[in-house]
């Protein structure tokens, strides 16, 4: 059952104790009631597992990826799962923890020590199924090892947003991924209307910056569904 899968993953998939995002007394918000967190060799249960549903990796944390918790599971059930450590099996880069990438189905280190100069790395883009590498289009892309030690500037090849400098995100460009600017207020953004639609983007946009969300431009409300323009707007 899903619950047994979730419970078996509970410890490794849970966040650390929460910081300063709690509400204030008297408001309609309170701090999260509790999470599992490490305490010596034991895990203290403040509250039980809190699965976080997602449609794509970007909705999860930097140490997580978005996938079905059961192999061949219901496509409508995807949650944020803990990233895979070195030498664990993977099907795409986002499954591997920061500092690693997916090569030949295994998470390998992207540390400089593990490179001789430059590496050749296959970036596999899957259309329609983000978790498959069988029917995706593969292109060879050369990645400089130094990108893992200095944050990538705009246009630098990347594997994930944490590879990019502040104000940039890692987004698809043709068959590879590069650091692109996070969108500013008023800029056109992409609102994914259905699960998996991001897999069809050859030129992917970043997400909207802090304090902004991707919403229909007010004067486009009357337009047809397919032509409605979304822009980054203040909350």
């Amino acid at each position: 059952t899903l619950n047994s899968v979730l419970n078996s993953n509970a410890i490794k998939n849970l966040p650390p104790p929460l910081g300063g995002a709690a509400g204030h007394p008297g408001s309609a918000v309170s701090a999260a009631p509790g999470i599992l967190y490490p305490g010596g060799n034991k895990y203290q249960t403040i509250d039980n597992y809190q699965p976080y549903p997602c449609a794509e990796d970007e909705e999860c944390g930097t140490d997580e990826y978005c996938a079905s918790p059961t192999r061949g599971g219901d496509a409508g059930v995807q949650i944020c799962l803990a990233c895979r450590k070195r030498r664990k099996r993977c099907m795409r880069h986002a499954m591997c923890c920061p500092g690693n990438y997916c090569k030949n189905g295994i998470c390998v280190s992207s540390d400089q020590n593990h490179f001789r100069g430059e590496i050749e790395e296959t970036i596999t883009e899957s259309f329609g199924n983000d978790h498959s590498t069988l029917d995706g289009y593969s292109r060879r892309t050369t990645l400089s090892s130094k990108m893992y030690h200095t944050k990538g500037q705009e246009g630098s090849v990347c594997l994930r947003s944490s590879d990019c400098a502040s104000g940039l995100c890692c987004a698809r460009h043709f068959w590879s991924k590069i650091c692109k600017p996070v969108l500013k207020e008023g800029q056109v953004c992409t609102k994914h209307r259905r699960k998996g639609s991001h897999g069809l983007e050859i030129f992917q946009r970043c997400y909207c910056g802090e304090g902004l969300s991707c919403r229909i431009q007010k004067d486009h409300h009357q337009a047809s569904n397919s032509s409605r323009l979304h822009t980054c707007q203040r909350h």
């Epitope: 849970l14 966040p15 650390p16 929460l18 995002a21 709690a22 509400g23 918000v29 999260a32 999470i35 809190q50 976080y52 549903p53 997602c54 449609a55 990796d57 970007e58 909705e59 999860c60 944390g61 930097t62 140490d63 997580e64 409508g76 059930v77 995807q78 949650i79 944020c80 994930r160 947003s161 944490s162 995100c169 994914h192 209307r193 259905r194 699960k195 997400y207 802090e210 969300s213 991707c214 919403r215 909350h235």
Partner: nanobody
């Protein structure tokens, strides 16, 4: 800051239905995953159901699967929990929770940061 207010709780007979609503204010919540949790007297708060920011992915606790349905209306900043075939063991305070935006906001873990005050659901036999 996100503020969450639940409504729709009440007393219902076993086998009956209720629809809970959770209204978010103070910030558009279309980038947040939303969840419902519940806490019965003397028990830990437990997960019930959750829905991704786009609404395309939903997950349920085994105990409510097939009976409860979570949905959201981003235009109305509201998330719903339709509860059918209610059982006495569903009696609890039901809480709405909003998650953060994951890696887009630099967090290492996606999590529920904001919680409502809860609404009481009592199912009599």
């Amino acid at each position: 800051e996100v503020q969450l207010v639940e409504s729709g709780g009440g007393l219902v007979q076993a086998g009956g239905s209720l629809r809970l609503s959770c209204a978010a204010s103070g910030r558009t919540f279309s980038s947040y995953a939303m969840g419902w949790f519940r806490q019965a007297p003397g028990k830990e708060r437990e997960f019930v159901a959750a829905i991704s920011s786009s609404g395309s992915s939903t997950v349920y606790a085994d105990s409510v699967k097939g009976r409860f349905a979570i949905s959201r209306d981003n235009a109305k900043n509201t998330v719903y929990l339709q509860m059918n075939s209610l059982k006495p063991e569903d009696t609890a305070v039901y809480y709405c929770a909003a998650g953060n935006g994951g890696r887009n906001y630099g967090h290492s873990r996606a999590r529920y940061d904001y919680w409502g005050q809860g609404t009481q659901v009592t199912v009599s036999s």
